[in-house]
Interface confidence: low
């Protein structure tokens, strides 16, 4: 019968010929006049056989990613009789993998949005690389992910490519981050090939800032002739949040005289001080009121950021107006 071992040829061999193995008949004692023949796709071009010994050589560089196995046929003939010594037999030469393909990231470019102040461990995005090498051949296609840029705010799970938050981030300090992830094959061992990808991570706003008055004291004046409903001035607070999280409502916190009101201009986010009752210079020529400002929308879980609303003091001076027919009797 035929005698041979499993045949493997490493891909990308740089030698002119590579000894693959030996096919032989167990009737071949070395003295027989046997001639070995190789048939099939690749015979004579990619592979040759030493007809005297049955030794098979690869004479071309092979690429496993192009073709991973060759099915060939062998014959052995006794040249003294011209008859086949063994029945023709089929055998396989497997091209064994070397690590000649680097990991490539799919679905680039990567972009993710995550709420600011998200806790450690929050999942941001998963990046995935693929490697054309043989997943069943050692570690050539076994990938490990690592973070090249993005510490200490982000981490990547080495085997899954899942990016997680590792430190809380404040959008008001920085609203986007570029993270660079490297995928290394050979599970990161020596000889590994690598690929990198960039991930743009944007922080979405959460309502973690309360509005704060720009001034601790406002001075306004009102004419004693002003009718009720008159706008006598504006006050303004600022909020480091954006969008809906920066919308605010102004209100009176303290006005013993109940003479003034504050309404909110939602377009400009200003507070408008309104005269609610007419004033009389001779009766009272100045007022002191306190205003407060709060966000319009605050989720229950963010209330901790909004305790003690910001307040400001407003001094209102009443301007005297000469009254017609004034004077003593």
């Amino acid at each position: 019968g035929w005698v041979w071992n499993q045949f493997f040829v490493p891909e990308e061999m740089n030698t002119t010929s590579h000894h693959v193995g030996r096919l032989r008949s167990d009737l071949d004692n070395g003295n027989n006049s046997f001639q070995y023949k190789l048939l099939g796709a690749g015979a004579g071009s990619t592979f040759i056989i030493d007809e005297r010994t049955g030794d098979i050589y690869a004479i071309e560089k092979l690429d496993r990613e192009e073709r991973s196995l060759y099915i060939l046929r062998a014959q052995v003939i006794d040249i003294t009789t011209g008859r086949a010594v063994e029945p023709e037999s089929e055998f396989v030469i497997k091209v064994s993998d070397i690590n000649d393909n680097e990991p490539k990231f799919l679905d680039e470019p990567y972009e993710a949005i995550v709420p600011e102040m998200s806790p450690e461990g929050t999942l941001v995005i998963q990046v995935t690389a693929s490697d054309a090498d043989d997943p069943s051949s050692g570690n050539n296609a076994r990938l490990l992910y690592s973070l090249l840029q993005g510490q200490p705010y982000f981490s990547v799970e080495p085997t899954t490519g899942v990016i997680r938050i590792s430190s809380k981030m404040d959008r008001e300090l920085q609203d986007e981050y570029w993270v660079i992830i490297q995928a290394k094959d050979m599970i990161g061992q020596p000889g590994a090939l690598s690929g990198t990808t960039s991930v743009l991570i944007k922080l979405s706003d959460v309502n973690d800032n309360k509005p704060i008055f720009k001034e601790s004291l406002y001075r306004l004046t009102v004419s004693e002739s002003a009718p009720t409903g008159t706008s006598i001035g504006t006050i303004m607070a600022y909020d480091n949040d954006i969008g809906e999280n920066a919308e605010m409502d102004y209100s009176i916190e303290e006005d013993d005289s109940q003479t003034f009101d504050i309404i909110t201009n939602h377009e400009t986010q200003e507070g408008i001080v309104i005269l609610k009752k007419k004033v009389n210079f001779e009766h009272q020529n100045h007022y002191g009121i306190r205003a407060k400002v709060k966000n319009h929308h605050v989720d229950e879980q963010l209330m901790k950021y909004h305790t003690e609303a910001s307040t400001t003091f407003i001094k209102i001076q009443v301007e005297d107006v000469d009254e017609p027919g004034g004077g003593g009797s």
Epitope: N5, P10, M13, N14, T15, H18, H19, Q189, P190, G191
Partner: antibody
Amino acid sequence: QVQLVQSGAEVKKPGASVKVSCKVSGYTFTSYFIHWVRQAPGQGLEWMGIINPISVSTSYAQKFQGRVTMTRDTSTSTVFMELSSLRSEDTAVYYCARGGIQLWLHLDYWGQGTLVTVSS
Amino acid sequence: QSALTQPPSVTGTPGQRVTISCSGSRSNIGSNFVNWYQQLPGTAPKVLIYTNNQRPSGVPDRFSGSKSGTSASLAISGLQSEDEADYYCATWDESMQGWVFGGGTKLTVLS
């Protein structure tokens, strides 16, 4: 079982060359790298170089570049290490050892060693 | 001077636990596996630990290896008189593109 059998002891004069052989058995000769390591009397181990029996590609330690040549004979499953321009400090036991399919994998089987004495 | 640094000698008594250290750099231990070889007097080295902490079959579990950063260590517990030998650490060096060995540590077991 895997065996690496080395040639016998040699005595050489300074300036001469020595060729040490290492015959392997018990496995497919072309499947693994063969490394050469030497040990001067009372000293530690020193790596000299490596040969890939499949491709005859070699890599030598910088210290031995130009003086060492590693070859192989697949027909006898034998690897050779030739060291030229011998000097007295080359007096050492020379070992061949089988490595893995990667350069950095450990040396699992060693020959019994060949003592080379360089003396005038 | 060896690329890897080991203590020249270590002494222990039977039953004791001893450790042998091996210090290197980023280009060798820092980026490759560490292997440990035992050389009994007058014999060829024999692999004791490979790939930092793996034991070949036939090596007792009294022998263990570990690696951290650019250094490694070999621990021998339940010391026996037959453990008296020279011990070498070794690894592949990326910058030298070759194998590097420690200078060797002579283990003496006092009876």
